[in-house]
């Protein structure tokens, strides 16, 4: 058993049929010694008396808010949550496996640049009695600070018969060094509580591996005289790290016909312009990627050929 | 070439070669073999390899003030990785394919380190750690980790040389 926060405790249980459970001793936070009784949740049934209460925690019915009283007055509360371990593996019932980039991916994170700011998000089908708390650091043995905000519900989607809820959180490394080569990964820890079930989820990454630039901005076409060719130009996104001579991007320019089956013409360039042939009804798209490290491509910025 | 006393390197040549190194490091990575182990091998080799750290002067301001600290750090790293790529980790079982980019990568690391340091001048170099893989699966795991770490190192080096070529070239 360990303390999650003041008066909230997590009991770790091996979860299998007829498991013995864990013996837990609760102590009433009071100077009083006599006449103390214990109850669980809203029930008035007295579970025991005395300053301490010993219980065998085996299932969710044994978890909840234990309250000690004296003469009708509440002295203190202890909320017990359960953390299930099945066959040596902690349960992951609350969050949905996003399966990208690999199985057992519950948290996904992205950064728009090297400033040390990043966003993480996760999915669940649970709509009520759900709380999240997020902590982060750079490294784990001698952790350096990362400050995270509160997790917020950022999207709701309908997936078949189920509603899916997306939560996200923004974090910022306290003393980021954008030009350095990271040697210790960022660790993100999410505590999830649904009713009386506790779970924790972690992700470990380097900022360089979660970089996804915003799409190029100001995408423009300039027709070339007496030619089907056009000059496409664009600019670095505002959110990208500066100076651009140091934090350089590379670009992919694509000409795509109306039909998805039509052959795509692609050009790769380090410049912020390119000359391409503009077919009727086609569109021109440009996306960006870090020039020296193959993290994610940005989403496409597009303009129609006409 | 970076010469003792602090004259400028051939920024443009270094830029071209470091960008080539980036490409080679990424093309070598998937070719060192099928690898599920990398998903689980969470302990980093990072304690064992040199890094371009915050105080090494490799940021734009540090390069403007005095690029020598940074260039020395890059040189150290290049020599270190060049030795690793020539070690038993890459030459031992399982054998690399004959056309593996690791050979080119090895040669390019040496080439860039020579551009930075002429004959007769010696910056300190870091000892290769004893990573002591005794099994082929351990070598394979280390190849992945070393190449991942090299990708990060050469990305910073390439940024340094690109910025130097754009702003510090005579």
């Amino acid at each position: 058993i360990w303390e999650l926060k003041k008066d909230v405790y997590v009991v770790e249980l091996d979860w299998y049929p007829d498991a013995p459970g864990e013996m837990v001793v609760l102590t009433c936070d009071t100077p009083e010694e006599d006449g103390i009784t214990w109850t669980l949740d809203q029930s008035s049934e007295v579970l025991g008396s005395g300053k301490t209460l010993t219980i065998q925690v085996k299932e969710f019915g044994d978890a909840g808010q234990y309250t000690c009283h004296k003469g009708g007055e509440v002295l203190s509360h202890s909320l017990l949550l359960l953390h299930k371990k099945e066959d040596g593996i902690w349960s992951t019932d609350i969050l949905k496996d996003q399966k990208e980039p690999k199985n057992k991916t519950f948290l996904r994170c992205e950064a728009k640049n090297y400033s040390g700011r990043f966003t993480c998000w996760w999915l669940t089908t649970i709509s009520t009695d759900l709380t999240f708390s997020v902590k982060s650091s750079r490294g784990s043995s001698d952790p350096q600070g990362v400050t995270c905000g509160a997790a917020t519900l950022s999207a709701e989607r309908v997936r078949g018969d189920n509603k899916e809820y997306e939560y996200s959180v923004e974090c910022q490394e306290d003393s980021a060094c954008p030009a350095a080569e990271e040697s210790l990964p960022i660790e993100v820890m999410v505590d999830a509580v649904h009713k009386l079930k506790y779970e924790n989820y972690t992700s470990s990454f380097f900022i360089r591996d979660i970089i996804k630039p915003d799409p190029p901005k100001n995408l423009q076409l300039k027709p070339l005289k007496n030619s089907r060719q056009v000059e496409v130009s664009w600019e670095y996104p505002d959110t990208w790290s500066t100076p651009h001579s140091y934090f350089s991007l590379t670009f992919c320019v694509q000409v795509q016909g109306k039909s998805k089956r039509e052959k795509k013409d692609r050009v790769f360039t380090d410049k912020t312009s390119a000359t391409v042939i503009c077919r009727k009804n086609a569109s021109i798209s440009v996306r960006a990627q870090d020039r020296y490290y193959s993290s994610s491509w940005s989403e496409w910025a597009s303009v129609p050929c006409s | 070439r970076a010469v003792p006393g602090g004259s400028s390197p051939a920024w443009t040549q270094c830029q071209q070669l470091s960008q080539k190194l980036c490409t080679l490091a990424w093309s070598a990575h998937p070719l060192v073999g099928h690898m599920d182990l990398r998903e689980e091998g969470d302990e980093e080799t990072t304690n064992d390899v040199p890094h371009i750290q915050c105080g090494d002067g490799c940021d734009p301001q540090g390069l403007r003030d005095n690029s020598q600290f940074c260039l020395q750090r890059i040189h150290q790293g290049l020599i270190f990785y060049e030795k690793l790529l020539g070690s038993d980790i890459f030459t031992g079982e399982p054998s690399l394919l004959p056309d593996s980019p690791v050979g080119q990568l090895h040669a390019s690391l040496l080439g860039l380190s020579q551009l930075l340091q002429p004959e007769g001048h010696h910056w300190e170099t870091q000892q290769i750690p004893s990573l002591s893989p005794s099994q082929p699966w351990q070598r394979l795991l280390l190849r992945f980790k070393i190449l991942r770490s090299l990708q990060a190192f050469v990305a910073v080096a390439a940024r340094v040389f690109a910025h130097g070529a754009a702003t510090l070239s005579p």
Epitope: - | M35, G41, E93, P133, Q135, P136, Q138, L140, L142, K145
Partner: antibody, heavy 121, light 111 residues
Framework: QVTLKESGPVLVKPTETLTLTCTVS????????ISWVRQPPGKGLEWLGV???????NYNSGIKSRLTISKDNSKSQVVLTMTNMDPVDTARYYC???????????????WGQGTTVTVSS | DIVLTQSPDSLAVSLGERATINCRAS??????????MHWFQQKPGQPPKLLIY???NLESGIPARFSGSGSRTDFTLTISSLQAEDVAVYYC?????????FGGGTKVEIK
């Protein structure tokens, strides 16, 4: 499908040399390492040695001086030679494939049925 | 050599009940976070069969009632609900250092 089949003498005399052949099919010896493991009657498993994809070998230090493992990739055969046999070497000898280096980390994923070798005069 | 000590030597479990076998290594069998510990099942008159590789990965074709956990020196094989066909001897094996070594085996029987 993947198969490994051991062949060789059932009976050898003390001080003689044992030669066992493992013939494999369904995979190439250039892609997978082969180990030899033995099991004395009613006892546990003992690893003898391995031949890697590139032809290098590692042996159990306890019997290294008596053991040689070689292979012929084109014939898909691995040969175990063990000199100076003794009655304590009586065991079932298994030829075993080591799983893909990058996934299995030294786990042996396919085993032959084994061949019982008795050492007796 | 790395010595693997299995416990218990034998185990009698009722059908449908849980069976747990432990394997302790005399030194760590982890290398950069990878546990080179594997589990085998051997039935009478048959060669051993790989069940779990790298401590916790279920070999293809093996029923999900088998699971493995652990790292460094302490490992566990669990059969969540014992079936009649699970009666066998179970071995752990390490491949972190030469020579590869096996545990002494644990015999699982029906109570």
């Amino acid at each position: 499908q993947v198969t490994l089949k051991e062949s060789g003498p059932v009976l050898v005399k003390p001080t003689e040399t044992l030669t066992l052949t493992c013939t494999v099919s369904g995979f190439s010896l250039t892609q997978y390492a082969i180990s030899w493991v033995r099991q004395p009657p009613g006892k546990g498993l003992e690893w003898l040695g391995v031949i890697w994809t590139g032809g290098g070998t590692n042996y159990n230090s306890g019997i290294k001086s008596r053991l040689t493992i070689s292979k012929d990739n084109s014939k898909s055969q691995v040969v175990l030679t063990m000199t100076n046999m003794d009655p304590v070497d009586t065991a079932r000898y298994y030829c075993v494939r080591e799983g893909d280096y990058g996934s299995y980390a030294g786990a042996m994923d396919y085993w032959g049925q084994g061949t019982t070798v008795t050492v007796s005069s | 050599d790395i010595v693997l000590t299995q416990s218990p030597d034998s185990l009698a479990v009722s059908l449908g009940e849980r069976a747990t076998i432990n394997c302790r290594a005399s030194e760590s069998v982890d290398y950069y976070g990878i546990s080179s510990m594997h589990w085998f099942q051997q039935k009478p008159g048959q060669p051993p069969k790989l069940l779990i590789y790298r401590a916790s990965n279920l070999e293809s074709g093996i029923p999900a009632r088998f699971s493995g956990s652990g790292s460094r020196t302490d490992f566990t094989l669990t059969i969540s609900s014992l079936q009649a066909e699970d009666v066998a001897v179970y071995y752990c094996q390490q491949a972190n250092k030469d020579p590869y070594t096996f545990g002494g085996g644990t015999k699982v029987e029906i109570k």
